[in-house]
Structures are given as structure tokens and as C-alpha cells.
């Protein structure tokens, strides 16, 4: 599930990783745009092994993956798109 959250909370990520995560290991991705209490964009990935990691938004692999997901957002996805807005 790909989520885009708009939230007034402070930054969620206390550390970020650039290590590649194969898509088959990913259960859900959450994107937190910058602003609204956090000065940077954050990307949170839930893995199928019940772990969770913040991914460096500058990591090439996550940028490529996000682009693929956006392009496929009108069709069935391995990681379906889910957008949710929080006031």
C-alpha cells in the first residue's frame, strides 16, 4: 500500500537507510511530504518480516520505485495505491 499522509506531527524518522529493499519484501510504503511540522520529506517502508524502516528519499532505488508506482497507479499494483489525508 502506498500512502500519502499530510500531518501536523513532528518528523517521524530518527534515522534513514539507503539500503535497497526488493519490492517482494515490501508490504506498504508511506510518504510524508515536507512541511506541517517536519522540514523534510519522509518515506516509511513496512517490510513483510514485520520490520519498519525510513528510507532516504534521495536513494535512487526508492525514487525509481515511486515512479513505477505512480505510473501504474491507474491499474492493479503489486503494492496498491492508498492515499489518506489527515487534517
Amino acid at each position: 500500500v502506498l500512502e500519502v499522509y499530510y500531518t501536523s506531527l513532528r518528523c517521524r524518522c530518527v534515522q534513514e537507510s539507503s539500503v535497497f529493499i526488493p519490492r517482494r519484501f515490501i508490504d506498504r510504503i508511506q510518504i510524508l511530504p515536507r512541511g506541517n511540522g517536519c522540514p523534510r520529506k519522509e518515506i516509511i517502508v513496512w517490510k513483510k518480516n514485520k520490520s519498519i524502516v525510513c528510507v532516504d528519499p534521495q536513494a535512487e532505488w526508492i525514487q525509481r520505485m515511486m515512479e513505477v508506482l505512480r505510473k501504474r497507479s491507474s491499474s492493479t499494483l503489486p503494492v496498491p495505491v492508498f492515499k489518506r489525508k489527515i487534517p
Epitope: 517521524r12 524518522c13 534515522q15 537507510s17 506498504r28 516509511i44 513496512w46 514485520k50 519498519i52
Partner: antibody, heavy 122, light 107 residues
């Protein structure tokens, strides 16, 4: 308000099966990212992680005890369970259940029950 | 399995002292470490998460640090209410493993 409370037999004999129940409120094990774990602590000693169960029924066990442990849940009644087969005196401990929520920042075992004391004695 | 070697197992310190407890990880855990405080007869409570971050409601005299595979919990000025057992937990990978615990007593 998140609360958890453990219940169990108090005392049992070697070779019996220990059955523990964790009854919780303030969260649901049907919610994405929610999990409950079991941890034990022999008197005056350190903590030992035993098992976790997650919202999707995914289960993780401590390999040193895996063949004796069974974790399960009853989502509708907000309960989690742990069974330990073939107990021995070394299983005498206080048993805790604790919540984990897969959110960032991830703090496993952020809420704990009060613990239940279990004694294995012949 | 990842082994967490915690030291000291017990220590006694005076009020106002600076106190440090250490856990050494047998493999890289990349800051996936929590420090719990457990007061006598009570359940553990998270104090520090991701090695260096203070949990909600924890006094600022507590801090966490890392040097290589060594993770430390420091109390800058010991108070009587800090008398407790302290446990580290690695959650980098299953099985989660705790250190053996440190009993902190007041002189």
C-alpha cells in the same frame, strides 16, 4: 488508554502445559501494524523475549523455545495467548505481555502488562 | 542470534553521580536498541529508543549514545527515583534479545 493484563495458573507441575492469557484494551489486533509479544523474567534475573503475534496472524518465536511455544490471538475479544508445553522448573518466572505497534518511531513493547507469576514445582 | 552483553550487572552510586551502563552487540544492530527501566515490583518502561532518543516523559538527565557496537545509557546526575534495573533490547532482527540487566542501587 492502552492497558494489558496477564492471567495464568499461578502454579503447575513439571511436564504440564502452561496456558497464559493477555487481555488488552485501547488497541485492536485487527489494526494494521499492531502486535503483542510475550516476555518472561525469572526472579532476580533478566528479560527473555518469547514470541510475537501480529495483526495478520504472523508469528515469531524464540528459537531456543520454539518447539514448546504456541502463540495465538482472539481478535474479537482483545486477547492474546501463549502456551508452553512440557514445562520444567526453569520455566518459573514472571510472564509479561506487551504491545508493539509498527509505526515510526518504532518502539517495540511500548506498553506492558503488570506480569503474572508462574511457578513450576512438583 | 545477536548477543547483547550488558555491563555492569550491578552498581552502586551516590546521588548526583554520573552513571553509565553499556550493552555491546555481537553483530551490527544499526541503532535498533531500546533501553528499559524497571523499578522494583513494576513492569519495564521504555526510556531510550533508537539508541539515542528520549521517550516521552523521560527526564533529560537520561541520554543514550553509541560507539561502534557499544551502546550506552547515561544518567548525568543520579536521583533517588532512578534506583531500578535497566535492560537493553535489540530489535534489529528476530529473535529479539535483551541484555542481562543492570541493577542500579543508591549508596
Amino acid at each position: 488508554q492502552v492497558t494489558l493484563k496477564e492471567s495464568g495458573p499461578g502454579i503447575l507441575q513439571p511436564s504440564q502445559t502452561l496456558s497464559l492469557t493477555c487481555t488488552f484494551s485501547g488497541f485492536s489486533l485487527s489494526t494494521y501494524g499492531m502486535g503483542v509479544g510475550w516476555i518472561r523474567q525469572p526472579s532476580g534475573k533478566g528479560l527473555e523475549w518469547l514470541a510475537n503475534i501480529w495483526w495478520d496472524d504472523d508469528k515469531y518465536y524464540n528459537p531456543s523455545l520454539q518447539n514448546r511455544l504456541t502463540i495465538s490471538k482472539d481478535t474479537s475479544n482483545n486477547q492474546a495467548f501463549l502456551k508452553i508445553n512440557n514445562v520444567d522448573t526453569a520455566d518459573t518466572a514472571t510472564y509479561y505481555c506487551a504491545r508493539s505497534e509498527l509505526i515510526m518511531p518504532y518502539v517495540p513493547f511500548d506498553y506492558w502488562g503488570q506480569g503474572v507469576r508462574v511457578t513450576v514445582s512438583s | 542470534d545477536i548477543q547483547m552483553t550488558q555491563s555492569p550487572s550491578s552498581m552502586s552510586a551516590s546521588l548526583g553521580d554520573r552513571v553509565t551502563i553499556t550493552c555491546q552487540a555481537s553483530q551490527d544492530i544499526d541503532n535498533h536498541l531500546i533501553w528499559f527501566q524497571q523499578k522494583p515490583g513494576k513492569s519495564p518502561r521504555p526510556m531510550i529508543y533508537y539508541a539515542t532518543n528520549l521517550a516521552n516523559g523521560v527526564p533529560s538527565r537520561f541520554s543514550g549514545s553509541r560507539s561502534g557496537s557499544d551502546y550506552s545509557l547515561t544518567i548525568s546526575s543520579l536521583e533517588s527515583e532512578d534506583m531500578a534495573d535497566y535492560h537493553c533490547l535489540q530489535f534489529k532482527q528476530y529473535p529479539f534479545t535483551f541484555g542481562s540487566g543492570t541493577k542500579l542501587e543508591i549508596k
